[in-house]
């Protein structure tokens, strides 16, 4: 007879990423023995929080903490109840609550304590909700994206670990309210502030990072909105025969568009507002967002921020992937090229709202939008980041690697449960043949 | 009042191919999609593909991309599904459907059905 | 890929309260669609834009959607709604149209 060996013990952990737009929670899992090779944390099971996200309630905190409720009783399901006290629980803000900070600090804070409240009721090891800042979320998105694709270290089959010589990815996440660029870089950092020095596994990464809050799409929008409303009297990236009523009040509240605010406006009034399917406005307009006139550095992105060449290849996620995935998918378009990126941005642009709403069935408003964030992608890539034709071939757009989904959430946990150890592993992997 | 007529049952051999015919009567395909759906016996509804014909636009299912190719002669207010390298599990009752821009282009008009048997 | 997920059977009472659910990842951020197939018959759309009704569908059969789950609800029901019911939604990301697995209602009595 063979003695059936169980399968190792399971860890989990649970990331709630509070977004701008709205939360997700990510439940991560691990055999027990294993915590310290690489791609060996896969995403277990995931849960999208139900309305806005938790800036969203400033004006009632403790439904901020009542909203994540369903999700967390989904927890207690996925995992097994006696790793329930062991199993780390963390929640993580993004730029949504960045702007509620600068903006409203005593209710950012209001809002952190109510969710606070509500995560200590359950039976997880709770460690904490707090905001991220910029360089942490570009940061941990990176780690993600190059621990799953196993870039840091691999298992090889003669039973060593060894450090692949495909080099890392950077990664380029466009959330709602902020974006965030990160790729490894030999070149020292003019700007002290965009430079993140990473002991993995005993190698040293020297990480380039930054993040553009009010560059996330959501913000984006409002702020070409902002500018439709101040400069026309229409709306050159949305399609022509859709109109809506704009409250002011929505979109001058936001401090992302501060500088198109009228110094007296009601902010109760509605405006209506049509689109007019004009492609070439519509790039004026999303080129009015950046700003190239100044730089400090040797070079720079944009808006005078220092930025070394972009090199390697790049993952691109988040909306990045969901635009560009629109474009290819539901459109239909080539978007192979920085060439053909911007002749489907165009072809979106030209699209009249009939057009487009029968391209693509059963939509909401939301739709009319993707015009707006084509061309925004398009010029972030090309003209803000410096992407060529030769540079762009290396960056693919993808939302998951391994079956998990590539954000800071994953690398964030990695970092806080210390599943990356600074140091390599032995120089033989450890097998227990007891 | 607008009515989709789908051509007549069919008996096909594995691996050969079949066309279905659906012709609007009573309108035309002007600001109008259609969708093809299947329904093998006793099972659910499984989307096809589908043809915006005054836009000459496409969509295939993942599933069926490479075998099934959907076509419209708007002059007959036609359109056509084909289905290639048939098997025994595309024997099913194949739906066009209309997409009709006052419903978000959802399926409100629907023909009773094509049926397709496969088998040797 | 997106996926929509239907009860297989609901039984109601005659004259009662029937609520089938459909389940799908922020299903709520999407439009759903109802349709209703009795034996031998073509579907037909009794309800759209999650909660509005076609000309011609009785004022009983309504629609909710929000966070994870969209329902159908049939009140005061009759023998003559005894068919399946089929949600549907449209996956942006694949760029097709997904169908639930269909519920079939039985009305008791």
């Known amino acids: 007879t063979r003695d059936i060996r169980e399968p190792p013990a399971l860890k989990y952990g649970i990331v709630l990423d509070a977004g701008s737009s709205h939360t997700s929670m990510f439940i991560y899992k691990w055999p027990a023995d294993k915590e310290n090779d690489t791609g060996i944390v896969g995403q277990h099971s995931s849960c999208d929080v139900p309305g806005g996200g938790i800036s969203s309630y400033a004006d009632n905190p403790s439904g901020a903490g009542q909203s994540l409720v369903g999700c967390l009783e989904q927890a207690l399901r996925d995992v097994p109840k006696e790793r329930h006290a062991g199993t780390p629980l963390y929640l993580g803000a993004t730029a949504g609550m960045r702007l509620l900070n600068l903006t409203n600090p005593e209710a950012s804070t209001s809002v952190l304590t109510a969710v606070t409240h509500t995560l200590t009721q359950y039976p997880f090891d709770f460690r904490g909700a707090r905001i991220l800042s910029g360089q942490e979320e570009g940061v941990f998105g990176w780690v993600t994206a190059n621990y799953l694709l196993e870039n840091f270290i691999k298992y090889g089959w003669v039973g060593r670990w060894f450090r692949p010589r495909k080099g890392t990815l950077g990664a380029m996440d466009l959330g709602g309210a902020s974006t965030q660029i990160t790729f490894e870089t030999t070149s020292p950092a003019e700007d002290r502030a965009s430079e993140v020095q990473l002991r993995l596994y005993g190698q040293h990464y020297r990480v380039y990072t930054h993040s553009f809050l009010c560059y996330g799409r959501d913000q984006v929008l409002q702020r070409l909105l902002a500018s439709a409303l101040q400069t026309h009297s229409f709306h050159p990236c949305w399609p022509r025969g859709f109109s809506t009523h704009v409250l002011l009040g929505d979109v001058y509240q936001s401090p992302c568009t501060v500088a198109q605010r009228p110094q007296t406006f009601n902010s109760s009034a509605r405006v209506s507002l049509s689109g007019s399917s004009d492609p070439h406005l519509c790039r004026d307009l999303v080129s009015g967002l950046f700003s190239f006139s100044s730089c400090p550095f040797s070079r720079c992105s944009f808006n005078g921020v220092f930025q070394p060449p972009v090199a390697g290849n790049f993952i691109a996620f988040s909306a990045f992937f969901y635009t560009v995935n629109f474009l290819r998918t539901s459109m239909g378009l080539p978007v192979a090229t920085l060439q053909q990126l911007e002749a489907a941005a165009v072809n979106v642009c030209n699209q009249t709202w009939a057009q487009l709403q029968a391209r693509v069935p059963g939509q909401q408003a939301h739709l009319a939008d993707y015009c707006a964030g084509a061309m925004f992608v398009q010029q972030l890539l090309s003209r803000g980041y410096g992407f060529d034709e030769r540079a762009f071939g290396g960056v693919i757009f993808q939302k998951k690697a391994a079956d998990t989904a590539v954000g800071w959430a994953l690398g964030y946990m990695l970092n806080l449960t210390n599943l990356i150890p600074a140091d390599p592993p032995g120089l033989r992997k450890g097998t227990d043949f007891s | 009042q607008v009515q989709l007529v789908q051509s007549g049952a069919e008996v096909k051999k594995p691996g050969s191919s079949v066309k279905v015919s659906c012709k609007a009567s009573g309108g035309t395909f002007d600001s109008y999609a259609v969708s093809w759906v299947r329904q093998a016996p006793g099972q659910g509804l499984e989307w096809m593909g589908r043809?915006?014909?005054?836009?000459?636009?496409?969509r295939y299912a993942q599933k069926f991309q490479g075998r099934v190719t959907i076509t419209a002669d708007e002059s007959t207010s036609t359109a056509y599904m084909e289905l290639s390298s048939l098997r025994s599990e595309d024997t099913a009752v194949y739906y066009c459907?209309?997409?009709?821009?006052?419903?978000?282009?959802?399926?409100?008009?629907w023909d009773q059905g094509t049926l397709v048997t496969v088998s040797s | 890929s997106y996926e929509l997920t239907q009860p297989l059977s609901v039984s109601v009472a005659l004259g009662q309260t029937a609520r089938i659910t459909c389940s799908g990842d922020a299903i709520g951020e999407k439009y759903v669609y109802w349709y209703q197939q009795k034996p031998g018959q073509a579907p037909v759309l009794v309800i759209y834009?999650?909660?509005n009704r076609p000309s011609g569908i009785p004022e009983r059969f309504s629609g909710s959607n929000s966070g994870n789950t969209a329902t159908l609800t049939i009140s005061r029901a009759q023998a003559g709604d005894e068919a399946d019911y089929y949600c549907?939604?449209?996956?942006?990301?694949?760029?097709?149209?997904?169908f639930g697995g269909g519920t079939k209602l039985t009305v008791l009595g």
């Open positions: 459907a209309r997409e009709s821009p006052g419903y978000r282009y959802s399926f409100d008009v």
């Open positions: 834009d999650d909660n």
């Open positions: 043809i915006v014909p005054w836009l000459g636009f496409t």
């Open positions: 549907a939604s449209y996956d942006l990301q694949q760029a097709r149209w997904v």
